[in-house]
Amino acid sequence: MMTGTIETTGNISAEKGGSIILQCHLSSTTAQVTQVNWEQQDQLLAICNADLGWHISPSFKDRVAPGPGLGLTLQSLTVNDTGEYFCIYHTYPDGTYTGRIFLEVLESSVAEHGARFQIP
């Protein structure tokens, strides 16, 4: 039975040209995290594997940095980066947990972080 929950940074906003950290945290389970996949809509951004470490998709290498932790840092943000991001936690023995983050990249200097929220 899957008992864990994914806590994410929720709905967040950031300025164009700036950077943002996407963070998810898996709690309420003793399952071992074997791999975390980060996706932007339908696009694989990066993989963090417990044994092999990080793999950043080559097409994002210039603007995506691993970490901190299992999170992902997006740099040189553009308006086109606005959208949904998913952290997919592959665990043993539980299976797969998915968290969702919505990022809005703003033209103005008014960019506030949304409240943290949980996805069961």
């Epitope: 074997t34 696009q43 694989l44 594997n49 592959h90």
Partner: antibody, heavy 119, light 107 residues
Amino acid sequence: EVQLLESGGGLVQPGGSLRLSCAASGFTFSSYGMTWVRQAPGKGLEWVSAISGRGSSTYYADSVKGRFTISRDNSKNTLYLQMNSLRAEDTAVYYCARTPYRSGWADYWGQGTLVTVSS
Amino acid sequence: DIQMTQSPSSLSASVGDRVTITCRASQNIKTYLNWYQQKPGKAPKLLIYAASSLHTGVPSRFSGSGSGTDFTLTISSLQPEDFATYYCQQTYSIPQTFGGGTKVEIK
């Protein structure tokens, strides 16, 4: 240099058994998932089975479930495929391949070993 | 199971030609799509992974694109050593499945 070397293929009668081996070298074997893929004569590729780096998770195609067992011995850097209740339609070249990431790609392949099931 | 449909099943082309092979998934597989090259009597070789990433050592004339259900492998200028059979593979879900293959032959 990554190397994968399959062995154990041969001629077997329907209903018989075979155990294929895949000896790995040139990388930290226990850190990588491994996969078996087969190819019937003149046909395309068919995914057969996969196993995680530590062997805790295994996966099978419906066509072999309950008959084939994938396993690994990380102390020997060797992957296995135990094939029981073999059928004529299992006749194929069997390849082992290294899969670096879960839901990932097979980046290095062995040369294959031929299994022929015939009476 | 996710069905992978490749087209064409075979094609004839000349050295220097631009060649495009398509692969369609029966459902959304995001970018969990790989391309392999296989020559007769040899093991497959990885060309492209995650839809568009070029595997180490693969010539830059090979490129991949697409996401969701529709994917393309392009060889920008066909070379003599490129005559082979090409397969797409989805690794989005178990069982992983391959397309039926595209045989690229000399015209």
